[in-house]
Interface confidence: low
């Protein structure tokens, strides 16, 4: 396959509601019509797929209905949002971009974004 450069931020802190957003930008060497974006999580030497979406250039990303990811695309960059994160989900989130069609196939893998998730402190009971 052919290599393609993918850039993503080194560190992102999830919000108190467990939402983390980051940009995944790729240097497209050709005129792709169909692009696949996959978010991988690396923790303890294990790589697991978090979510994936395929989109036509110029159109919106469509993740599966039950996906924890949402995203929008603009040119050669994808804005990814991961929801429902908890402290145990802290890890390195890698953006993988594939120019699926037409051939030749291009693959780009980012260095990963370290997402830190801190579970919010439970609210103390209030007496009314």
């Amino acid at each position: 396959c052919k290599a393609m450069h993918v850039a993503q931020p080194a560190v992102v802190l999830a919000s108190s509601r467990g939402i983390a957003s980051f940009v995944c930008e790729y240097a497209s060497p050709g005129k792709a019509t169909e692009v696949r974006v996959t978010v991988l999580r690396q923790a303890d030497s294990q790589v697991t797929e978090v979510c994936a979406a395929t989109y036509m250039m110029g159109n919106e990303l469509t993740f599966l209905d039950d996906s924890i990811c949402t995203g929008t695309s603009s040119g050669n960059q994808v804005n990814l949002t991961i929801q429902g994160l908890r402290a145990m989900d802290t890890g390195l989130y890698i953006c993988k971009v594939e120019l699926m069609y037409p051939p030749p196939y291009y693959l780009g893998i980012g260095n990963g974004t370290q997402i830190y998730v801190i579970d919010p402190e439970p609210c103390p009971d209030s007496d009314f």
Epitope: C1, K2, E34, M100, P102, P104, Y105
Partner: antibody
């Protein structure tokens, strides 16, 4: 076993139409880009058409553009090639071929699986 | 389109001989070159990918080398079952193009 089986070939008159099918089995058909490659009698291999794994993107060789239409039905694991306005020079064995696509951290790009081919003869 | 030129178009060699086929691309294709074997009446079969990588299950007597525009395919010791036509194919630029083929026969 990974397998591709073409069908639908036969004898057709110039200007006629034919629809080729390629039934896939033994792999996740919907994850792969699929292509048609043909071989005229005693000649070499010529790429004809390709379709992305989703079916939303297609490409054609200049020699068949506007006359051939590639499509796929992922629910039936089947690839199609609708051939219209056929010419004598379209006479060939038509192979469907899988363009290697596996969603790993390493990827490859070549035709790794081929069908046995189906013969299309255009003659009056 | 990238033109692929194979030579020779045919050759005849004895069992045990070393056989070499060359493939030249009309422009630099890095190492994005694949080799296929096609036996009479059969579909092509992938032997070598990315110029030098042997496909799983392919005998080690087959090998490939080269980069840029000039590539070589070698059968180190020709066997009777190697009678076939061999094709190179570039995977660098769309559309894919094949060489015209080299027919290998036994003397």
């Amino acid at each position: 076993e990974v397998q591709l089986v073409e069908s639908g070939g036969g004898l057709v008159q110039p200007g006629g139409s034919l629809r080729l099918s390629c039934a896939a089995s033994g792999f996740t058909f919907s994850s792969y880009s699929m292509h048609w490659v043909r071989q005229a009698p005693g000649k070499g291999l010529e790429w004809v058409s390709g379709i992305s794994f989703s079916g939303r993107s297609t490409s054609y060789a200049d020699s068949v553009k506007g006359r051939f239409t590639i499509s796929r039905d992922n629910s039936k694991n089947t690839l199609y090639l609708q051939m219209n306005s056929l010419r004598a020079e379209d006479t060939a064995v038509y192979y469907c071929a899988r363009y290697l696509m596996s969603f790993n951290l390493t990827r490859t790009s070549w035709f790794d699986v081929w069908g046995q081919g189906t013969l299309v003869t255009v003659s009056s | 389109d990238i033109q692929m030129t194979q030579s020779p178009s045919s050759l005849s060699a004895s069992v045990g001989d070393r056989v070499t086929i060359t493939c030249q691309a009309s422009q630099d294709i890095s190492n994005y070159l694949n080799w296929y074997q096609q036996k009479p009446g059969k579909a092509p079969k992938l032997l070598i990918y990315d110029a030098s990588n042997l496909e799983t299950g392919v005998p080690s007597r087959f090998s490939g080398s080269g980069s840029g525009t000039d590539f070589t395919f070698t059968i180190s010791s020709l066997q009777p079952e190697d009678i076939a036509t061999y094709y190179c194919q570039q995977g660098d630029a769309w559309p894919w193009t094949f060489g015209q083929g080299t027919k290998v026969e036994i003397k």
